[in-house]
């Protein structure tokens, strides 16, 4: 089900991430450090529990979840959000809600790459990962 995502991934390109973070409402200082970070993403599956760990000089974060079940998350930029992740057409689609706001993060496979699309209102950031 999520096996195509399993493994260790390194960020190789990032487009429009600062504008996305601005739209989310992330402050300048946090945007600067987060934008400079080159995270590794480690995805593992244990039964119906999926774990996504992000490691960088900026912040290490980890979420463990079951598909379709809402969970609490503290994001790398320090938002306290309610998240739900579902599988949609082979993509992991995450919706984060906080302070009356909502953003969608879609993780999908594209050839040998893992592409992460972050959408907030009309602003989209695309971040591409390759296997480490």
């Amino acid at each position: 089900m999520c096996d195509a995502f399993v493994g260790t991934w390194k960020l190789v390109s990032s487009e429009n991430f600062d504008d996305y973070m601005k739209e989310v409402g992330v402050g300048f200082a946090t945007r600067k450090v987060a934008g400079m970070a080159k995270p590794n993403m480690i995805i593992s599956v244990n039964g119906d529990l999926v774990t996504i760990r992000s490691e960088s000089t900026f912040k290490n974060t980890e979420i463990s979840f079951k598909l379709g079940v809402e969970f609490d998350e503290i994001t790398a930029d320090d938002r306290k959000v309610k998240s739900i992740i579902t599988l949609d057409g082979g993509a992991l689609v995450q919706v984060q809600k906080w302070d009356g706001k909502s953003t969608t993060i879609k993780r999908k496979r594209d050839g040998d790459k893992l592409v992460v699309e972050c959408v907030m209102k009309g602003v989209t950031s695309t971040r591409v990962y390759e296997r480490a």
């Epitope: 601005k22 409402g25 992330v26 402050g27 300048f28 200082a29 946090t30 600067k32 450090v33 400079m36 970070a37 000089t57 900026f58 912040k59 994001t75 930029d77 320090d78 938002r79 302070d99």
Partner: antibody, heavy 119, light 108 residues
């Protein structure tokens, strides 16, 4: 509980340099940026810059670029700000504060170090 | 740089009176990044309201914050003696981070 400890006062001569310290405790030092703020007697607050202990990345207000150098020692959970070529205009209270991510507000403040530049 | 203009610069209020302090921002910012601090003489500033409307820990519920874009305000529903202080607004959306010049609130 989160604490930022700063020396109470420093007296230095014009033209000299001084290194102000800010020792953090009660949280994971590398998880939050440390920012520095200047307040002249009877005046408002000015942001000098900040440093992210996890990466060592710094951002300085252009106004203080040639005046202030920010560093950290993660082994002692201490942030430092070196001020150079001191003049009477540098006499002020200097605060360090912890930056809370996302909102980027200063959620915990040190007591401030009163710097007096005088011959 | 983004300039924050606070008004009034100085005001006095009687106990029980409603108080409103405004902060006008020279260019639009995210409401998540507008904050207020309280400072009493000879002490460090304290975080008071963050993200426009969130009260910092320990702040009495008579305080509230509102606004968006370029116009923000801090309101005290009923002035108390302990509220006498200087209040600063601050923006964290744009480089460099900037503060307003402060509003000194005195007890009448």
């Amino acid at each position: 509980q989160v604490q930022l400890q700063q020396p109470g006062a420093e007296l230095v001569k014009p033209g000299a340099s001084v290194k102000l310290s800010c020792k953090a405790s009660g949280y994971t030092f590398t998880s939050n940026a440390i920012t520095w703020v200047k307040q002249r007697p009877g005046q408002g607050l000015e942001w000098i810059g900040d440093i992210s202990p996890g990466s060592g990345s710094t951002t300085n207000n252009e106004k203080f670029k040639s005046k202030a150098t920010l560093t950290v020692d993660t082994s002692s959970s201490t942030a430092y700000m070196q001020l150079s070529s001191l003049t009477s205009e540098d006499s002020a209270v200097y605060y360090c504060a912890r930056l809370r991510g996302y909102y980027d507000y200063f959620d915990f403040w040190g007591q401030g170090t009163t710097l007096t530049v005088s011959s | 740089e983004v300039v924050l203009t606070q008004s009034p610069a100085l005001m006095a209020a009687s106990p029980g009176e409603k108080v409103t302090i405004t902060c006008s921002v020279s260019s639009s910012i995210s409401s998540s990044n507008l904050h207020w601090y309280q400072q009493k003489s000879e002490t460090s500033p304290k975080p008071w309201i963050y993200g426009t409307s969130n009260l910092a820990s320990g702040v009495p519920v008579r305080f509230s914050g509102s606004g968006s874009g370029t116009s923000y305000s801090l309101t005290i529903s009923s002035m108390e003696a302990e509220d006498a202080a200087t209040y600063y607004c601050q923006q964290a959306s744009h480089y460099p981070l900037t503060f307003g010049a402060g509003t000194k609130l005195e007890l009448k």
